[in-house]
């Protein structure tokens, strides 16, 4: 009896959909695996007789529920199928946006770049897919614990009237208000303000 794959899960970030599993202990030899997806009542092979423990399902539609399954094989024997269901538009992880930060005197000027849909070669982004897409920004004085959050209206934001000659750190994430779903935070970017531009009277 061939044991089934273990810990079967979907690892999906920005619609790069990778089904992953672990090979079970099997004394007779090395196992291979076949992974399939359900397409209009029929299961279609995606990865056949692979020695890998993952399979790329990124070509699946972003919309609707998909049934995926994987089994282990040895010679002419095979395990039972292990099934999972997956809805990319609901389940994919929203990766961190890009961010450009520029210091102008006592202000930080930020521009945000929505993460690209990973499995495509054009410039579609996660913002295209999700109508309610917005950004959350958090910033803080470097070395302090207090963080401030804002929700920019656009793909850019300016933090004004900051303390001069002070290092501020900023990070951004995508947020979907209609789904109450937050993406991953970008790595903090820390920049030092310069002088206060106000002219003394």
């Amino acid at each position: 009896m061939v044991p089934p794959p273990e810990n079967v899960r979907m690892n999906s970030v920005n619609f790069k959909n990778i089904l992953q599993w672990e090979s079970p202990a099997f004394a007779k030899g090395n196992l291979t695996f076949t992974a399939q997806y359900l397409s209009y009542r029929i299961f279609q092979d995606k990865c056949m007789n692979t020695t890998l423990t993952e399979c790329d399902f990124s070509s699946l539609s972003k919309y609707g529920d998909h049934t995926l399954r994987v089994r282990a094989e040895f010679a002419d024997e095979h395990s039972d199928w292990v099934n999972i269901t997956f809805c990319p538009v609901d389940d994919t992880i929203i990766g961190p946006p890009g961010m450009q930060v520029e210091v102008l005197a006592d202000s930080l000027h930020m521009r945000f770049l929505a993460p690209k849909i990973e499995n495509e070669y054009e410039t579609w982004t996660m913002k295209n897919v999700y109508n309610s897409w917005t950004y959350n920004v958090q910033y803080w004085k470097n070395g302090t614990d207090e963080k401030f959050q804002i929700t920019p209206q656009y793909d850019f934001e300016v933090l004004r009237n900051l303390e001069p000659w002070t290092t501020y750190c900023v990070q951004v994430r995508g947020f979907l208000p209609d789904r109450n779903k937050a993406g991953e935070w970008s790595e903090p970017v820390c920049e030092q303000t310069t002088h206060d531009e106000t002219v003394p009277s």
Partner: nanobody, 126 residues
Framework: QVQLQESGGGSVQAGGSLRLSCAAS????????MGWFRQAPGKEREGVAT???????NYADSVKGRFTISKDNAKNTLYLQMNSLKPEDTGMYYC????????????????????WGQGTQVTVSS
């Protein structure tokens, strides 16, 4: 909400031609992958022709040289020109769309398209 509406089906003699159209609302054809699928009675739905946002096309072997897929982005309409029709081309023809898709992966199965029209019937008699 994306909506697709096919038209242009009908009955034709073998060797004849038909042109199917698929009009979209809530979606722009320039932003994704489109396809024509068909389903004969008692059979599974199968891919006939697909077109990516960059205009690149793919055809099922059974229709190569006879069918042509195209799109008019300005009219937001997808077409399937079917020439030299055969009785085995008979079936319900469906238009399918997958928004924000560029063809980074070849898409050829039902599960790879998220939105579907209601279909238009094509009948080819000998």
């Amino acid at each position: 909400q994306v909506q697709l509406q096919e038209s242009g089906g009908g009955s034709v003699q073998a060797g004849g031609s038909l042109r199917l159209s698929c009009a979209a609302s809530g979606y722009t054809y320039s932003s994704g992958c489109m396809g024509w699928f068909r389903q004969a009675p008692g059979k599974e739905r199968e891919g006939v022709a697909t077109i990516n946002s960059d205009g690149s096309t793919n055809y099922a072997d059974s229709v190569k040289g006879r069918f042509t897929i195209s799109k008019d982005n300005a009219k937001n309409t997808l077409y399937l020109q079917m020439n030299s029709l055969k009785p085995e081309d008979t079936g319900m023809y469906y238009c399918a769309a997958e928004p924000y898709c560029s063809g980074g992966y070849p898409r050829w199965s039902v599960a790879e398209f998220g939105y579907w029209g209601q279909g238009t019937q094509v009948t080819v008699s000998s």
